[in-house]
């Protein structure tokens, strides 16, 4: 048996930020579960990582370098992504394992969500007035 | 080829303590969680600790928890558990596995043996 997730099908990250929420088919409650976010279409980077039971505070890593935290729904986790390069943009996968008590238990793959990182533009310098006609 | 490997096993007197490891090689160990599980003597297989992949996270089963500590060390690829105030009823084979739906991967196992 497989937990389902649902995630939004694209986000733009218009101030290099993003909240990405992950929706999931399981109540977490009373549960030690590990939700983690991973980066490009093979997963291959782990951007996130949210441990979290209901009897202590959640415990948020990225050993990728990313900037992140999290927050905790019943059935949610929300990623919350700070200072975000354009580079970064790609297609990003949430994932759920139920860690305690057995028997592990994780999601089927999401379809995931395309993350549009937009650069900061700086405000262009007002033109200068021509001159002035007597 | 996936590999496990245990190693540490042997006979301890009740209260005494044993660190085991698990050698792992033919996959990349970094990327997965890991767990010990046991079998006693006439018994069905006990779960007994995982960590999961960055080494972040530990649980326990109740019977070994405050007694037993797992570990990892992901640039030699080896999982590690700590045993101490050992009793009789820890007298198991001792595995190490992938810890997953699957357990895809699963050492050999290592006798442990607690008696006085």
């Known amino acids: 048996n497989k937990i389902l997730v649902k995630q939004s099908p694209m986000l733009v990250a218009y101030d290099n930020a993003v909240n990405l929420s992950c929706k999931y088919s399981y109540n977490l409650f009373s549960r030690e579960f590990r939700a983690s976010l991973h980066k490009g279409l093979d997963s291959a980077v782990e951007v996130c990582v949210v441990y979290g039971n209901y009897s202590q505070q959640l415990q948020v890593y990225s050993k990728t370098g990313f900037n992140c935290d999290g927050k905790l729904g019943n059935e949610s986790v929300t990623f919350y992504l700070q200072n975000l390069y354009v580079n970064q943009t790609d297609i990003y996968f949430c994932k759920i394992e139920v860690m305690y008590p057995p028997p592990y238990l994780d999601n089927e793959k999401s379809n995931g969500t395309i993350i549009h990182v937009k650069g900061k533009h700086l405000c262009p310098s007002p033109l200068f007035p021509g001159p002035s006609k007597p | 080829e996936v590999q496990l490997l245990e190693s540490g096993g042997g006979w301890v007197q009740p209260g005494g303590s044993l660190r085991l490891s698990c050698a792992a090689s033919?996959?990349?160990?970094?990327?997965?969680?890991m767990a010990w599980v046991r079998q006693a003597p006439g018994k069905g297989l006990e779960w007994v600790s995982v960590?999961?992949?960055?080494?972040?996270?530990?649980y326990y089963a109740d019977s070994v928890k405050g007694r037993f500590t797992i570990s990892r060390d992901n640039s030699k690829n080896t999982l590690y558990l700590q045993m101490n105030s050992m009793r009789a009823e820890d007298t198991a084979v001792y595995y190490c596995?992938?810890?997953?739906?699957?357990?895809?991967?699963w050492g050999q196992g290592t006798l442990v043996t607690v008696s006085s």
């Open positions: 596995a992938e810890y997953s739906g699957a357990f895809d991967y």
């Open positions: 033919g996959f990349t160990f970094s990327r997965y969680h």
């Open positions: 960590i999961d992949s960055l080494g972040l996270q530990a």
